[in-house]
Amino acid sequence: MAVTACQGLGFVVSLIGIAGIIAATCMDQWSTQDLYNNPVTAVFNYQGLWRSCVRESSGFTECRGYFTLLGLPAMLQAVRALMIVGIVLGAIGLLVSIFALKCIRIGSMEDSAKANMTLTSGIMFIVSGLCAIAGVSVFANMLVTNFWMSTANMYTGMGGMVQTVQTRYTFGAALFVGWVAGGLTLIGGVMMCIACRGLAPEETNYKAVSYHASGHSVAYKPGGFKASTGFGSNTKNKKIYDGGARTEDEVQSYPSKHDYV
């Protein structure tokens, strides 16, 4: 019973985690304009992995996709790759873990097979969570570096008279969603791996048999070994519902005639 609960909870936690990873990857607010010195701004900039957006004080929001691959920073490409790998691994893990669930019967699948699948999905969830955390952390590090660089060059004088204010960016909501989601996926994966141990069937212990050889006697005592559960991590596979991973920010970024102006 405890094993089933642990497995089920691991699945649900990972499912939520992967939904969060998908949501974070799709969100536009990975970096947002720093408003420390100016809390009310007429033009607000924010950027995601796939496009950058500008929201005017009128309420009008315009988003532009990054229609280039080669022109993008290598770090951004790396973050995209990490998030996509995390989603793919998580999705496969979820698929595997559905069949591994103890409460679901599929034909005459043995417990050892379910244990293997649970461990596989668990490991996949762990890797998926780590990918998401790594991706978000790389992006956050990039932001911190750029933030202090732009602070150092905050105002560049032109002819000693005109000031060009450099836009500084800080952590967006997507980073926090990504960190939490990655953590949940990781926790779910660990839970699946723990559940896997309880699923592994005990092998029969055979009585020791002594074999007497001429010369000197050596006793072989086989038995007492647990069946190997194989490998595989409990990676949760999250179902993507159409539009379900869309965030409030993203919905807002499509202006309608009734946007505030």
Partner: antibody, heavy 119, light 113 residues
Amino acid sequence: QVLLQQPGTELVKPGASVKVSCKASAYTFTSYWIHWVKQRPGQGLEWIGRIRPSDSDSTYNQNFKGKATLTVDKSSDTAYMQLTSLTSEDSAVYYCSMGAYYSNSFGYWGQGSLVTVSA
Amino acid sequence: DIVMTQSPSSLTVTAREKVTMNCKSSQSLLNSGNQKNYLTWYQQKPGQPPKMLIYWASTRESGVPDRFTGSGSGTYFTLTISSVQAEDLAVYYCQNDYSFPFTFGSGTKLEIK
């Protein structure tokens, strides 16, 4: 055609207050910011502030904080600007304007209200 | 606050002549996020409220004749009237709509000979 109707003139005494109205018609009042702009006779334009009719969220020019108060009455699609402790410096034409949909600029303007502060 | 400086303060031209007026801002009005310049040009005819001509420094408002052209980026902007008509007699204002408070230039008065 969007219409912003303002009273033509307001004659007030120094130290008194005045409430200038701006009645909107032919558009969804709650969907667009209302801005207020001051123009002294023969001079340039000065932005006073703006208000969003849907929730009365407002932004003021610091130079007019304490001088102007922006309010709206959604039931009558009317925006108001109250000016307090009036002096001769406040004698001017006050325009209300509707924020543009696509930018931060002012798309439509009222005809303006001339506020004259005189003893 | 961003200070908007317009030049010249007034100019007199003959009909069908080309005219150019300038506007300079104390800070860049170019937004890096969308590469747009947040500057608007208004026309105010005598006894009338201002009317928007150009927004985003170079985008003509619908219904505005194509003889009006806005250009410039960052801190320097110009409004050009390719062939001045009698009805163009007005004061022309530039406005910063990049940061609060929104500020206007002192205006350029266009007079026709």
